[in-house]
Amino acid sequence: AAPCPDACCPHGSSGLRCTRDGALDSLHHLPGAENLTELYIENQQHLQHLELRDLRGLGELRNLTIVKSGLRFVAPDAFHFTPRLSRLNLSFNALESLSWKTVQGLSLQELVLSGNPLHCSCALRWLQRWEEEGLGGVPEQKLQCHGQGPLAHMPNASCGVPTLKVQVPNASVDVGDDVLLRCQVEGRGLEQAGWILTELEQSATVMKSGGLPSLGLTLANVTSDLNRKNVTCWAENDVGRAEVSVQVNVSFPASVQLHTAVEMHHWCIPFSVDGQPAPSLRWLFNGSVLNETSFIFTEFLEPAANETVRHGCLRLNQPTHVNNGNYTLLAANPFGQASASIMAAFMDNPFEFNPEDPIPVSFSPVDTNSTSGDPVEKKDETPFGVSVAVG
C-alpha cells in the first residue's frame, strides 16, 4: 500500500494516526470521527489546547494518545463527549496541571502523564491520590513536579475539598409552612456552588438566594411529600467537589389502611400506615389487644427510601377458626390517630357447639383510644416477601 500523505492516516479498522510533524493545531474535522475507537497523535507542537468542541462526535473513542506535542491546557469538560474513554496518554507535552473534573465521569484504566512539566499544587491532589491508591497505572510513572521533586512528596495538608454546613429549622415544620435552608461553604479556592433539588418535584415552591460563601434556599408552602426527599448543597474547588444532603421533616397526622387477608405460605393481613413522626402501632383482635408472638406478628416490607408510608402484614402462621374475627390496626402520632378494621376468616369452626375452644394467642382488654405501641419506623425491618420467612 502506498504511504498515506495526509496529516492523519487510518490505522486498523477504527483507528487514526496523526504523526506528520506540525500538521495539526486542533482536532476539528477529523475524518471518520464518529466511528473512531483509537486516536494516536504525535509530534504536533501546534496542538496546544484540548477543549470540549475538539472531541465532539468522537462518542466511540476508547483510546486517546497525544504525545510529544505542545499540549498546554486540557479543558475540564474536554472529554464530555467521549464517555467510553478508558486509556488516555498525554505524556511528553507541556501540561503544568490537569483538573480533577477532566477525568471525572470517565472509567480510566490508564492515565499517562509522564514527561510533563507538572506544577505541584492542590489542583493535583487528586492525581497524588491516584498514585497513593494505585489507580490508572499512575504509580509506575513516578511523576515529578517541575523543579519540585516527586508528586508523591507534595505537601497536601491544606488541600481539602470545600466544607459545607447546611442549617435546617429546629422547630417542627407543618404542611403549608415556608422553610429557609442555608448552606455555609468554607474552603480555599472556591469555584462554584449550588443546590440539587431533583427529588423535590411538587413538594414545595423553590426560591434560591445568595451566593458563595452562603447560599439560601426557601421552600415555600411545603407538602407532606417533602418528607424523605434529599435537598443537596454542593460546592467545588480545585481539589474536588463536596455535597451535603439534608431532609426536612414535615409533620402530618397518622393514617392507616387495611386490606383483605391473603394466603401465601402463611396468612397476611396487608396494611399501610403513614404519618410524620412515624406513628406507633397497635393491633386489636375482637376489641382486645393482640399480643404478638412468633405465630402472629407485624412484619414490614422494606421501606422505600423516599417516602414515609410503610407497608406490611399482620403475619399469621397456621391460623385456625379461633383466629377468625375482627382485626383493627390503631396508628397514632402527636398530630392525630387513625384506625382501620377488617373481618378475617381463616377456617370454619369444626366445633360449632363449643364456643370455649382454647385460643392459641394471648389477648388483654384495651381502651381503643390507646396510642401506645411500637414505633413503625424502624431502621432494620423485616424484608419479608423476598424469601419465605416463618416466625
Partner: antibody, heavy 118, light 107 residues
Framework: QVQLQQPGAELVKPGASVKLSCKAS????????MHWVKQRPGQGLEWIGE????????NYDEKFKTKATLTIDKSSRTAYIQLSSLTSEDSAVYYC???????????WGQGTLVTVSA | DIQMTQSPASLSATVGETVTITCRAS??????VAWYQQKQGKSPQLLVH???TLAEGVPSRFSGSGSGTQFSLKINGLHPEDFGSYYC?????????FGAGTKLELK
C-alpha cells in the same frame, strides 16, 4: 447455610448470673424469631421463650419469666439469654433455635452447657 | 397450656424392626405437631412437622401421622443410626411444649 453458634460451656457459682450468646449467620436475621430451649442432663426439652429480632419483643413460658431475660444485638446478629439467681436446678444445656419455612425448629445451635457449682 | 403426653418412655428394638412412638395432646391441636430425634451430646434434629410432613433430608423410613389429639411417629425398618431419643412438640401457639421423650435403645 444457616448456622447458630453457641459457646460450649459456662461454669458459674450459685446465686450468680450468666449471659449466653447465640450468633446467627446464613439467613436474614430479622426475618425469624429466636427461641431458647433448656435441657437438664438426661431430661427432656423445655421451651423458655422467644424474641423478635426486629423490635426486641419477647414472650416467655410462665416458668421462666423471672429466671430468663432474652435480648438481641442486631448489629452483631447475636441473640442472648441471661439467667439470674442461679441454682443447681439451672444446670443444663441451653439451646437457641429458629423455625425453618414452617413453624418447627429446623435449626438449632450446638447448645451451651451451664454448670452451677460452688 | 397444652400438655403433650408421649409414650413409651423407653423402647428396646433391633435393627430392621419397625417401631411406633405416640403422643397425645391435652386438646385439639389440628395437625400442628413436630417430631425430633436427638443423639447423645448433640442438638435435636427435626424429623417431621405438621404431623406428617418429612423435614428436608429425612429418610423415608420415618413417617408421621395423626391429627386432633392423637399423633404417632413410625420408623419402618430401624437402621443403626436411628437409636437415640425422640421428642414430640406441638406448634399450635405459645407456650410451645414438648413430650417427655422416648429413649429408643438397641435390644
Amino acid at each position: 447455610q444457616v448456622q447458630l453458634q453457641q459457646p460450649g460451656a459456662e461454669l458459674v457459682k450459685p446465686g450468680a448470673s450468666v449471659k449466653l450468646s447465640c450468633k446467627a449467620s446464613g439467613y436474614t436475621f430479622t426475618s425469624y424469631w429466636m427461641h431458647w430451649v433448656k435441657q437438664r442432663p438426661g431430661q427432656g426439652l423445655e421451651w423458655i421463650g422467644e424474641i423478635n429480632p426486629n423490635n426486641g419483643l419477647t414472650n416467655y413460658d410462665e416458668k421462666f419469666k423471672t429466671k430468663a431475660t432474652l435480648t438481641i444485638d442486631k448489629s452483631s446478629r447475636t441473640a442472648y439469654i441471661q439467667l439470674s439467681s442461679l441454682t443447681s436446678e439451672d444446670s443444663a444445656v441451653y439451646y437457641c433455635a429458629k423455625y425453618g419455612n414452617y413453624v418447627a425448629f429446623a435449626f438449632w445451635g450446638q447448645g451451651t452447657l451451664v454448670t452451677v457449682s460452688a | 397450656d397444652i400438655q403433650m403426653t408421649q409414650s413409651p418412655a423407653s423402647l428396646s428394638a433391633t435393627v430392621g424392626e419397625t417401631v411406633t412412638i405416640t403422643c397425645r395432646a391435652s386438646e385439639n391441636i389440628y395437625s400442628y405437631v413436630a417430631w425430633y430425634q436427638q443423639k447423645q451430646g448433640k442438638s435435636p434434629q427435626l424429623l417431621v412437622h405438621n404431623a406428617k410432613t418429612l423435614a428436608e433430608g429425612v429418610p423415608s423410613r420415618f413417617s408421621g401421622s395423626g391429627s386432633g389429639t392423637q399423633f404417632s411417629l413410625k420408623i419402618n425398618g430401624l437402621h443403626p443410626e436411628d437409636f437415640g431419643s425422640y421428642y414430640c412438640q406441638h406448634h399450635y401457639g405459645i407456650p410451645l411444649t414438648f413430650g417427655a421423650g422416648t429413649k429408643l435403645e438397641l435390644k
